[in-house]
């Protein structure tokens, strides 16, 4: 059941010409690297996972979401230093006892081979060669992503 | 000190024509409401603060950042029901013992009159009439924002 504000919002929006929607990201902004249909920003500084999530959000982007093993490998190929860890948008959901991407989907167990424990306050980082479970309070770098493909007709799922 | 990957990224980007940068958000996407130079999305569902932050991030947006009292009032005018609470992008930083926006800036004490305690695990919600400190685990609605102004020449601060 939608509140009046939501009905109002939907009415206003649906009465508008849909071609006025967001034109999408045609090219990557300065300092962002293109990787296929995404723009990636590798942080210079370190933060716990939650602050990294907030940083990407304020940049109107998301902590990195990795679709499959192929995307993981291509992302890892951009990491030059073997020892550096980067947060991605995956953490352990205690209530669901599973790894959960920040978009709400669960990890397909075949996608990533995670080193470390699946437990409370665990978040996922990637290095040049591996995927690690770390305490979310650990201060490491992080990767933000923006979708590069135009999102003109992208309708966000009901939040 | 920049890593080789970051130097490489900067070199690649600076050699590109800067007009290829993100054209910005010219109009609000469907279901989003325009409020001055922002697009706002009022959620339909409920979540703790952290999940709300993640939701906005995956929508390539930010939990609402409020510049001043005037913007607060205009946002509150969009809320129809007096009792409904919405998360915004402000929470209590225990280490700094202060309210902190998710973009890293601190609350100007004159901006918002917060009802409730400034303590660990406290996050800020707004209603039609007030600003409340609630436990961050409280499951309520939330507001995401996208900047409407073109960000062609916007260079993200060193992250």
């Amino acid at each position: 059941q939608k509140s009046s504000i939501e009905k109002c919002s939907v009415d206003i929006q649906q009465s508008r010409n849909k071609t006025t929607e967001r034109p999408g990201l045609l090219n990557c902004p300065i300092y962002w690297q293109q990787l296929r249909e995404k723009c990636l920003l590798f942080s210079h500084t370190v933060n716990p996972w939650n602050n990294s999530l907030a940083d990407c959000s304020t940049k109107e982007s998301s902590l990195l979401l990795i679709r499959d093993k192929d995307e993981l490998i291509h992302t890892q190929n951009l990491i030059r230093d073997k020892a550096i860890l980067f947060w991605i948008g995956l953490n352990f959901s205690l209530s669901e006892k599973n790894w959960k991407w920040i978009n709400g989907s669960f990890l397909n167990s075949n996608d990533l081979e995670i080193r470390g424990d699946a437990k409370e306050n665990s978040c996922i980082s990637i290095s040049q060669t591996s995927v690690y479970s770390e305490y979310c309070s650990t201060e490491i770098r992080w990767i933000c992503q923006k979708e590069l493909t135009p999102v003109r007709n992208k309708v966000y799922p009901d939040s | 000190q920049k890593s080789s990957i970051e130097k490489c990224s900067v070199d690649i980007q600076q050699s590109r024509n800067k007009t290829t940068e993100r054209p910005g958000l010219l109009n609000c996407p469907i279901y989003w409401q325009q409020l001055r130079e922002k697009c706002l999305l009022f959620s339909h569902t409920v979540n703790p603060w952290n999940n709300s932050l993640a939701d906005c991030s995956t929508k390539e947006s930010s939990l609402l950042l409020i510049r001043d009292k005037d913007e607060l009032i205009h946002t509150q005018n969009l809320i129809r029901d007096k009792a409904i609470l919405f998360w915004i992008g402000l929470n209590f930083s225990l280490s700094e013992k202060n309210w902190k926006w998710i973009n890293g800036s601190f609350l100007n004490s004159n901006d918002l009159e917060i009802r409730g305690d400034a303590k660990e695990n406290s996050c800020i919600s707004i209603s039609q009439t007030s600003v409340y400190s609630e436990y961050c685990s409280t499951e309520i609605r939330w507001i995401c924002q996208k900047e409407l102004t073109p960000v062609r020449n916007k260079v993200y601060p060193d992250s």
Epitope: S95 | V46, A83, I84, L85, Y135, S137, E139, R141
Partner: antibody
Framework: QVQLVESGGGLVQPGGSLRLSCAAS????????MSWIRQAPGKGLEWVSY????????AYADSVKGRFTISRDNAKNSLYLQMNSLRAEDTAVYYC???????????????WGRGTLVTVSS | DIQLTQSPSSVSASVGDRVTITCRAS??????LAWYQQKPGKAPKLLIY???VLQSGVPSRFSGSGSGTDFTLTISSLQPEDFATYYC??????????FGGGTKVEIK
């Protein structure tokens, strides 16, 4: 239609246990804080416990803490109250109640079941 | 715990009368207050929330006011179906949620 239906009440001896259930229908159960509230015969209302939409946050009145356990199954649209170590003073009609959506832990109960009577007596 | 004191505990009134019930909180609760109506053998019904917001479907003769510690429920013109017991409830984040002792509105 939108409703809550409690079940599981009955007569139990002091020290015994009961499990109350509440079946929800007609609304998106997983989006609401749910509570149990009781009313002793001829007396006023007493809030017993609440559970958040995801089940992650739970609270109890001091009078039942350590003895009662609230839980929910969003897939089954059901709320539960496991009552152990029952006492005579737990005798009451137990209501399942829904809170207004998105007022967080400020629980205004906008939908109530008809209640189920729990009698604790030897 | 936050105590809520309702007064009067009972009131006798006639159809058409204006009835006022008060609820006093032992400490400030902002506008986090609700009013319920309960008839014998029935579950309570939400009338007012956030101190003054009329719940959907509730007749406009019911109104609520107040903030902080002092609150009022007013029935502008009592109808036969309004004879019942009325409870206030505080819903701050300070647990437990507490109800007032109730006010019984009886036929004069």
């Amino acid at each position: 239609q939108v409703q809550l239906v409690e079940s599981g009440g009955g007569l139990v001896q002091p020290g015994g246990s009961l499990r109350l259930s509440c079946a929800a229908s007609g609304f998106t159960f997983s989006q609401y804080y749910m509570s149990w509230i009781r009313q002793a015969p001829g007396k006023g209302l007493e809030w017993v416990s609440y559970i958040s939409p995801s089940g992650a946050t739970i609270a109890y009145a001091d009078s039942v803490k350590g003895r009662f356990t609230i839980s929910r199954d969003n897939a089954k649209n059901s709320l539960y109250l496991q009552m152990n170590s029952l006492r005579a003073e737990d005798t009451a009609v137990y209501y399942c109640a829904r809170s207004l959506m998105s007022t967080g832990t400020h629980l205004y109960f906008d939908l109530w079941g008809r209640g189920t009577l729990v009698t604790v007596s030897s | 715990d936050i105590q809520l004191t309702q007064s009067p505990s009972s009131v006798s009134a006639s159809v058409g009368d204006r009835v006022t019930i008060t609820c006093r909180a032992s400490q400030g609760i902002s506008s986090w207050l609700a009013w319920y109506q309960q008839k014998p053998g029935k579950a309570p019904k939400l009338l007012i929330y956030a101190a003054s917001v009329l719940q959907s479907g509730v007749p406009s003769r019911f109104s609520g006011s107040g903030s902080g510690t002092d609150f009022t429920l007013t029935i502008s013109s009592l109808q036969p179906e309004d004879f019942a017991t009325y409870y206030c409830q505080q819903v701050t984040s300070f647990l437990p949620y507490t109800f007032g002792g109730g006010t019984k509105v009886e036929i004069k």
